[in-house]
Interface confidence: low
């Protein structure tokens, strides 16, 4: 019960932050114009990855996409390239967790197959979030040496002619949203992989029957000493008795003094 | 690249009138377009500006003496002032801020038109 919750709110928490880098991603308020000592004053303009727009205090607004690829700042390509990667691996992570879903059922699919699935899409998940956080906090940094490149510049002149006004920029909505949905998909991909070790295949639930025999008084358990399938805790597979014998689990190579001959 | 040329300074008596041009050319249509005035020994300060939708802005000592206008069709800006005084004389360069994905505005300037005003 506790994985198929877990398993569901990560997806979920997902979807919301695969949903907001890509809302992030379209938004034109990636930088918004600082308005300090701007002599056109009824000018306000705000820019995206893909657009630049200017908002006037008429209510006049134009967006024009950048019109040139070679002329955009490389870092402004790479940031693009880490967003669009961002939502492609949340997307197939979304389509591969849909049929994960331990709620769902698909034919006979194993349980072994959904916590590879969910394993796989937990991993996209935090590729596709740390590849919005990394986007957006390039981008973030861009603006930040931008900004104080240009309050520098503000009065300082270009060929011997004084400039007299320098518009600066500081950070918009969509590098907030970014932040949130890079973090919200991050989490969300943590969640499946956390959930993914609790997928193991479920045995049937025998009761554990006692058998007397002389001498020894031992519950056996059917399936008590299978062997792990490397999806986590081993919780099914408990030492029933002090034989000797031990699970996988238990059998790790914890360090000894031999270890170190 | 954008290319601004000026053109419609010359000798003026106080009082009189002129009308100068700032022509465009080159790449795109600007979002922002403005006259600038440096006189001699002083620091260039704007005189007037004129956005892409229409709104403009005026330096309070040029209010109701000059007006800003643009024909966004052929590219052009103008400024029409009239009422003309002694300190006005000056040299006046034409602006035009180009909004791109640079995080500031790329900022083109003419080469100046000399406007003096003398009886």
């Known amino acids: 019960m506790a994985v198929t919750a877990c398993q569901g709110l990560g997806f979920v928490v997902s979807l919301i932050g695969i949903a907001g880098i890509i809302a992030a991603t379209c938004m034109d308020q990636w930088s918004t114009q600082d308005l300090y000592n701007n002599p056109v004053t009824a000018v306000f303009n705000y820019q995206g990855l893909w657009r630049s727009c200017v908002r006037e205090s008429s209510g006049f607004t134009e967006c024009r996409g950048y019109f040139t690829l070679l002329g955009l700042p490389a870092m402004l390509q790479a940031v693009r390239a880490l967003m669009i990667v961002g939502i492609v691996l949340g997307a197939i992570g979304l389509l591969v967790s849909i049929f994960a879903l331990k709620c769902i059922r698909i034919g006979s699919m194993e349980d072994s197959a959904k916590a590879n699935m969910t394993l796989t899409s937990g991993i996209m998940f935090i590729v596709s979030g740390l590849c919005a956080i990394a986007g957006v906090s390039v981008f973030a940094n861009m603006l930040v040496t931008n900004f104080w490149m240009s309050t520098a510049n503000m009065y300082t002149g270009m060929g011997g002619m004084v400039q007299t006004v320098q518009t600066r920029y500081t950070f918009g909505a969509a590098l907030f949203v970014g932040w949130v949905a890079g973090g919200l998909t991050l989490i969300g991909g943590v969640m499946m992989c956390i959930a993914c070790r609790g997928l193991a295949p479920e045995e049937t639930n025998y009761k554990a029957v006692s058998y007397h025999a002389s001498g020894h008084s031992v519950a056996y358990k059917p399936g008590g000493f299978k062997a792990s399938t490397g999806f986590g805790s081993n919780t099914k597979n408990k030492k029933i008795y002090d034989g000797g014998a031990r699970t996988e689990d238990e059998v790790q190579s914890y360090p000894s003094k031999h270890d170190y001959v | 690249q954008v290319q601004l040329v000026e053109s419609g300074g010359g000798l003026v008596q106080p009082g009189g009138s002129l009308r100068l041009s700032c022509a465009a050319s080159g790449e795109i249509s600007s979002d922002a377009m403005a006259w600038y005035r440096q006189a001699p020994g002083k620091q260039r300060e704007l005189v007037a500006g004129m956005t892409r939708g229409g709104s403009t802005n005026y330096a309070d000592s040029v209010k109701g003496r000059f007006t800003i206008s643009r024909d966004n069709s052929k590219n052009t800006l103008y400024l029409q002032m009239n009422s003309l005084r002694a300190e006005d004389t000056a040299v006046y360069y034409c602006?035009?801020?180009?909004?791109?994905?640079?995080?500031?505005?790329?900022?083109?300037w003419g080469q100046g038109t000399l406007v003096t005003v003398s009886s």
């Open positions: 602006n035009a801020e180009i909004y791109t994905g640079t995080f500031y505005p790329r900022s083109y």
